[in-house]
Structures are given as C-alpha cells and as structure tokens.
C-alpha cells in the first residue's frame, strides 16, 4: 500500500488582534489577517484579527465595501498592523461597488 500524501501545512501568519473576539490577547495567528470597519447603530466599530481558515476569509475578503462595512485582508506576519479599513463614500466608482469611493 502506498503512503498517504502528506497534508500540506498552510502557512500561519501573526496578526494584530483588536476587538471583542480577541479576549485579552493583542495578537492571533491564522491563514489571513484582516482589518475591518462596520457601522452599528451609527457607531463605527474597528476590528482587526485573523481568518483562521483560508476559506473562511475568502468570501469576506472578496466582498466589496458597502456603506455599512469594509474589510481589508492580507497575508504576511503583522500585515494588518498599519492597515485601517475605510468605508466608501458616494462619488468615484470603486471596483465591484455601486458608485462609491474610499474616504
């Protein structure tokens, strides 16, 4: 019987973690890092963290910004350190969005 193919170990990245999901840690490890901004009841909520499984982040990261939410994703250690997600505003067109541009 042939040996099983070795499982490919996905690369894990260290990411800045900010927000309720981080508990009392300021970093996390995952296959992608993200920085997000969402508007809840008129309040801006900034979060940073990890997408643990690549598939988990794939859809979210491909979603174009909307007036209520924006997510920026990256792969690399601490790549979300200096990234702040921005909401689009009406004006210049943004790829995949309806006539919005970044602030």
């Amino acid at each position: 019987m042939e040996d099983e193919e070795p499982k490919v170990n996905p690369k894990l990245y260290m990411c800045v973690c900010e927000g309720l999901s981080c508990g009392n840690e300021d970093h996390c490890e995952g296959q992608q890092c993200f920085s997000s901004l969402s508007v809840n009841d008129g309040f801006r909520v900034y979060q940073k963290g990890c997408f643990q499984v690549y598939e988990q982040g794939k859809m979210t990261c491909k979603t174009p910004p909307s007036p209520g939410q924006a997510v920026e994703c990256c792969q690399g250690d601490w790549c979300n350190r200096n990234v702040t997600a921005r909401l689009p505003t009406k004006g210049k067109s943004f790829p995949g969005s309806q006539n919005f541009h970044l602030e």
Epitope: Y13, Q52, D77
Partner: antibody, heavy 119, light 112 residues
Framework: QVKLLQSGAALVKPGDSIRMSCKAS????????IHWVKQSHGKSLEWIGY????????NYNEKFKSKATLTVDKSSSTAYMEFCRLTSEDSAIYYC????????????WGQGVMVTVSS | DVVMTQTPVSLPVSLGGQASISCRSS???????????LHWYLQKPGQSPQLLIY???NRFSGVPDRFSGSGSGTDFTLKLSRVEPEDLGDYYC?????????FGSGTKLEIK
C-alpha cells in the same frame, strides 16, 4: 543569527526585587513575542507570561501576576522581567524565549539567569 | 489549566535503539483556528531547552529526521529512532493552545 542574551546570575535576599534583562539581536525585535519561563532546580518548566514588544501588551500566568512585571525597551531591543518580594521559592533559572512565527512555538531561548534567594 | 501528563519519567535506551515518549493533555489541544499547538523540546545537560518538533509533527530546522512527532486531540507521541549520544537529556512537551501555556513534567533519556 538570532540571539537572546540574558543578564548574569544573581544572589538576592528574601523580600528584595530583581530585574533581569534579555537583549535580542539578529532579527526585528518588535516582530516577535517574548515569553518568560521558570525552571526550578531539578523540576519542569513553568510559563510566566509574555510581552508583545511592538504594543507593550502583556499576558501573565495567574500564578505570577503579583510577582512578575514584563517590560521592553524598543530602542535597545531589550526585554525585562522584574520579580518582586522574592522568597526561596523563587530560586530558579529564568529563560526569555522568542515565540516563532508560523506556529513554531518557542524557537529561540536565552541562556537563562540563575537567581538564588538566600539571606 | 491544561495538565500535561508525560510518561515515562525516565527512559533508559541503548545507543542505536528506539525511544518513545508520550504526552497526554487534560483537554483537547485543537485551537479555534484548527491547529494543534503541541511542541517538543530537548534540554541537554547544562543547556537551555531547544525546539525539536512544533505543531505535533513538524521538525524544526536542523533537527534530524530520527525525531518524529505524532498524535491528535489529547494524545501525542515523540519517537526517536537510532538514538545517539547527543540525544541524551530531558524531553518536554508544551501546549500553547490554551492560556496559561503548560509543560509536561519531563522525560529523562539515559543510556541503558
């Protein structure tokens, strides 16, 4: 190459405090979390806590919360651990260790600081 | 806290022989990100511990292929084939899935 150079052995009196240092070289200091580990004579290893040199964020083992204080000096790429109210139970070797990326655990260790608490 | 139970405490082996060390955790070491943060270290006499295996089965750079790690969930094993004199020392498992991080109590590998 990566090196963590710790301060020298110390003989201290009960009730005193001690501050030990861990100078990092061979990598970008603010990109790797620094942990501290205690090894009592002839015993296993105990995790004390960590500090994120970039943010200064810390996390402590509950057991050492009132005993240890972790700080860093980014300008000199040095991590520090202060141990207070020393007792004979604190006599041990203390290691600073670097937590590697890509889930590698503690990839580099300092040479250790032997602390002896005795009157 | 997660308790790491390591066995045996002492392991006498013949040079060129095989050795197996077990580490059991009191709860699953599978992290919310799907990874299992179980690592193995060797502490040679008078030295600092050194990383052998990370995340259950990955050899750290420079570690010979005589060392291998396996396991899942709560049950892990470090195997050493063709034991050489430089392999002697204390072996420790460490879990870094849960805070506080916890080590096994150690296994002393010695010549029979």
């Amino acid at each position: 190459q990566v090196k963590l150079l710790q301060s020298g052995a110390a003989l201290v009196k009960p009730g005193d405090s001690i501050r030990m240092s861990c100078k990092a070289s061979g990598y970008t200091f603010t990109d790797y979390i620094i942990h501290w580990v205690k090894q009592s004579h002839g015993k296993s290893l105990e995790w004390i806590g960590y500090i994120n040199p970039y943010s200064g964020g810390t996390n402590y083992n509950e057991k050492f919360k009132s005993k240890a204080t972790l700080t860093v000096d980014k300008s000199s790429s040095t991590a520090y651990m202060e141990f207070c109210r020393l007792t004979s139970e604190d006599s041990a070797i203390y290691y600073c260790v670097r937590r590697g990326h890509d889930g590698t655990g503690f990839d580099y260790w300092g040479q250790g600081v032997m602390v002896t608490v005795s009157s | 806290d997660v308790v790491m139970t390591q066995t045996p405490v002492s392991l006498p082996v013949s040079l060129g022989g095989q050795a197996s060390i077990s580490c059991r955790s009191s709860q699953s070491l599978v992290h919310s990100n799907g990874e299992t943060y179980l690592h193995w270290y060797l502490q040679k006499p008078g030295q600092s511990p050194q990383l052998l295996i990370y995340r259950v089965s990955n050899r750290f750079s420079g570690v010979p292929d005589r060392f291998s790690g396996s396991g899942s969930g709560t049950d892990f094993t470090l195997k050493l084939s063709r034991v050489e004199p430089e392999d002697l020392g204390d072996y420790y498992c460490l879990q870094s899935t849960h805070l506080p991080l916890t080590f096994g109590s150690g296994t002393k590998l010695e010549i029979k």
